[in-house]
Amino acid sequence: DQVDVKDCANHEIKKVLVPGCHGSEPCIIHRGKPFQLEAVFEANQNTKTAKIEIKASIDGLEVDVPGIDPNACHYMKCPLVKGQQYDIKYTWNVPKIAPKSENVVVTVKVMGDDGVLACAIATHAKIRD
């Protein structure tokens, strides 16, 4: 279930897990279904807050991903301590009206009090029924 991602910060992310997805194989996001994501990262700062930002490029058009709870402290225990590893588990209910696409790039960024905590880009996602 471990998937390959491109780091877009300073290699804070240790691993990303998505049930049913493997390595660099296409990862299917099903419309109207829950999409589970787990990420392990090492905090690069002490922070009281952790805010998640998810953007998707669908056929080259960048969009904010709807229906996201931005407070990462709802799904991991805050505050975060620099140097410690944390496990984020999040389930996103994919909208039924999400556009179908074979070319989806997802960028997940976690922001702390002093800037980027972690950042990953998944380049092999697809949105299907």
Epitope: N71, C73, H74, K77, C78, T91
Partner: antibody
Framework: EVQLVESGGGLIQPGGSLRLSCAGS????????MAWVRQAPGKGLEWVST???????FYADSVKGRFTISGDNSKNTLYLQMGSLRAEDTAVYYC????????????WGQGTMVTVSS | SYELTQPLSVSVALGQTARITCGGN??????VHWYQQKPGLAPVLVIY???NRPSGIPARFSGSSSGNTATLTISSAQAGDEADYYC?????????FGGGTKLTVL
């Protein structure tokens, strides 16, 4: 002073609709994480809905498809549009602000009573 | 769905220590918050993130959490502490409250 004031409660027949308002002062409602929480007479607290500054909304299963949470930046007000009301929706409805440095509701309104009865 | 279990009532003698528990599966891995509610009034946050007190809350109020139990402790209980107390956690994007505990100060 930072505070929230609810209004819009009242007596409504089953199947009817009602819109609750929550006016904020001392902070901007629409740039904060905001929630509605209700309390049936003699019962405990029950979460109803949450809205985040980016516009994402979440609902308890008991109200999903019937209630809609929203905010108006110009009025600095949070709303709860309630439809297809049932007797079990009878409760005091509170709006509350979530402090993101605490993940807890640090500011609450005084509550507004909604009674669903024929 | 995630559930939190609290005792319906707890009694404490004036000036003694009251402990109110909140049980949940692996609750120690979550941030636990506590609210005090007096009759006819809105809830008031008394402890956030397991053990932190908001400004204005007396030092008599403290909290802890580990394993499957979180505990709100009120030392040297006063008559004014008589109220309902609720624990709260986030289960991903869902707010979960405990059923509430009525604290009686004898």
């Amino acid at each position: 002073e930072v505070q929230l004031v609810e209004s819009g409660g009242g007596l409504i027949q089953p199947g009817g609709s009602l819109r609750l308002s929550c006016a904020g002062s001392g902070f901007t409602v629409t740039t904060n994480y905001m929630a509605w929480v209700r309390q049936a007479p003699g019962k405990g607290l029950e979460w109803v809905s949450t809205i985040y500054s980016a516009g994402s909304t979440f609902y308890a299963d008991s109200v999903k498809g019937r209630f809609t949470i929203s905010g108006d930046n110009s009025k600095n007000t949070l709303y709860l549009q309630m439809g297809s009301l049932r007797a079990e929706d009878t409760a005091v409805y509170y709006c509350a602000r979530e402090n993101p440095a605490q993940d807890a509701f640090d500011i609450w309104g005084q509550g507004t009573m909604v009674t669903v009865s024929s | 769905s995630y559930e939190l279990t609290q005792p319906l009532s707890v009694s404490v003698a004036l000036g003694q220590t009251a402990r109110i528990t909140c049980g949940g599966n692996n609750i120690g891995s979550k941030n636990v918050h506590w609210y005090q509610q007096k009759p006819g009034l809105a809830p008031v946050l008394v402890i956030y993130r397991d053990s932190n007190r908001p400004s204005g809350i007396p030092a008599r109020f403290s909290g802890s959490s580990s394993g499957n139990t979180a505990t709100l402790t009120i030392s040297s209980a006063q008559a004014g502490d008589e109220a309902d107390y609720y624990c709260h956690v986030w289960d991903t994007s869902t707010v979960v409250f405990g059923g509430g505990t009525k604290l009686t100060v004898l």
